[in-house]
């Protein structure tokens, strides 16, 4: 699997989980969330090569007529595969309220 | 959505469903199969700037970050979304088969 | 330079829907929490609703819960009020305003509103 | 709901006068929730002061707020004609946000 044990052990041009923190306040703008400051975001890079971690039977199909045409602009993309939540925890005025953000962490990568 | 009632009838850069007809022995080099000799795979392709057709929370917050961060690498890529399968002939010998492959065709994008 | 522009306000009889729009520019529109407040001919300001962009965490005030919806295209920079089943009391100038940066927090920001008028 | 109840309804002074309106909370707001907004006739409101103290940009400093608990007061210093206008309060220290009825400022 192209998550954070192989991709953040192995120095790997192709599609990779990436590590990146992202801070609310400096990155996003975001005053409203009190806790946490920041999180491991990560994200998805690296190019698709034949048969790399191909997920569907299209990208598979997709990389193997790039590689019979390499001229074809139609490759496989890196992007998200497994996504987690992330708890955070903000204020309603003087109300603090802990909310679930659904597929906030990438944790696993495909070329799809 | 990014398929091809609104991909096909507009000149977009952005990511879009790009129309791509494969046919299998020419550009997968594939004899095995005898009908169809070919079909509409179609691929995903153009740029995903500032949260354009962004599927997750993440894509989401990826994108904000990219425009708060221009010098970031880490910006979402254009994938495909909904998939649909393929029916095929093809021999067992003497014999013909009648094959579903699935997610073959891709009929809608986004960014990822 | 930033700029909130309503638009959408209109007659309509009760019962009726309606459709605001309040349009950004001159920030991070997804930075910031939106809110709707309106305020009825000669009349104080009454809070109506608020969203949080990117995760569209929405909140509503009791007296229109269930008949308006807030939403937010983060892509067009476009804040939305969806108002179904209007009452007369409805009857407003209608303001779209961006908070200082909390989700409850004073607002910087005030389109120039739009009027609403909901009559047989 | 947290009701806000503004003094005196309206008031007038005079150019070059100081005035001072009254805001007060059915309960603690602490230090910091409260806004206050200037609204010309025919405009839109205009955010003079948040966090109860704190003038917003461009705001001229004689405008000042203060108060805590369930008391806040808005003060005018050098009052000039273009002052005139409808003042509300706001308590964003509790959800949903409340507003004052208004104090009406009117030169004489």
């Known amino acids: 699997a192209l998550d954070a044990a192989y991709c953040f052990r192995n120095v790997q041009d192709n599609c990779c989980l990436r590590p990146l923190y992202i801070d609310f306040k400096r990155d996003l703008g975001w005053k409203w969330i009190h806790e946490p400051k920041g999180y491991n975001a990560n994200f998805c890079a690296g190019a698709c090569p034949y048969l790399w971690s191909s997920d569907t039977q299209h990208s598979r199909v997709l990389s193997l007529y790039n590689t019979i045409n390499p001229e074809a602009s139609a490759s496989p993309c890196c992007v998200s595969q497994d996504l987690e939540p992330l708890t955070i925890l903000y204020y309603i005025g003087k109300t603090p309220k802990i909310e679930q953000l659904s597929n906030m962490i990438v944790k696993s990568c495909k070329c799809s | 959505a990014l398929d091809a009632a609104y991909c096909f009838r507009n000149v977009q850069d952005n990511c879009c469903l790009r129309p791509l007809y494969i046919d299998f022995k020419r550009d997968l080099g594939w004899k095995w199969i005898h009908e169809p000799k070919g079909y509409n795979a179609n691929f995903c392709a153009g740029a995903c700037p500032y949260l354009w057709s962004s599927d997750t929370q993440h894509s989401r917050v990826l994108s904000l970050y990219n425009t708060i961060n221009p010098e970031a690498s880490a910006s979402p890529c254009c994938v495909s979304q909904d998939l649909e399968p393929l029916t095929i002939l093809y021999y067992i010998g003497k014999t013909p088969k009648i094959e579903q492959l699935s997610n073959m065709i891709v009929k809608s994008c986004k960014c990822s | 330079d930033v700029q909130l522009v309503e638009s959408g306000g209109d007659l309509v009889k009760p019962g009726g829907s309606l459709r605001l729009t309040c349009v950004a520019s001159?920030?991070?529109?997804?930075?910031?929490?939106m809110h709707w407040v309106r305020q009825a001919p000669g009349k104080g300001l009454q809070w109506v609703a608020y969203?949080?962009?990117?995760?569209?965490?929405?909140y509503y005030a009791d007296s229109v819960k269930g008949r308006f919806t807030i939403s937010i295209d983060n892509s067009k920079n476009t804040l939305y009020l969806q108002m179904n089943s209007l009452k007369t009391e409805d009857t407003a100038t209608y303001y779209c305003?961006?908070?200082?940066?909390?989700?409850?927090?004073?607002?910087?920001?005030w389109g120039q509103g739009t009027l609403v008028t909901v009559s047989s | 709901d947290i009701v806000m109840t503004q003094s005196p309804g309206s008031l007038a002074g005079s150019p070059g006068q100081q005035v001072t309106m009254n805001c007060r909370a059915s309960q603690s707001l602490g230090s910091s929730y409260l806004a206050w907004y200037q609204q010309k006739p025919g405009q839109h409101p205009e955010l003079l002061i948040y966090?109860?103290?704190s003038r917003a940009p461009g705001v001229p400093d004689r405008f000042s707020g203060s108060g805590s608990g369930t008391d806040f007061t808005l003060t005018i210093s050098n009052l000039q004609a273009e002052d005139v206008a409808n003042y509300y309060c706001?308590?964003?220290?509790?959800?949903?946000?409340?507003f004052g009825q208004g104090t009406k400022l009117e030169i004489k």
């Open positions: 001159g920030y991070t529109f997804s930075s910031n929490v």
């Open positions: 305003a961006r908070t200082l940066g909390l989700v409850l927090d004073a607002m910087d920001y």
């Open positions: 706001q308590q964003y220290a509790d959800s949903p946000i409340t």
């Open positions: 966090g109860a103290s």
């Open positions: 969203v949080i962009p990117i995760v569209d965490i929405a």
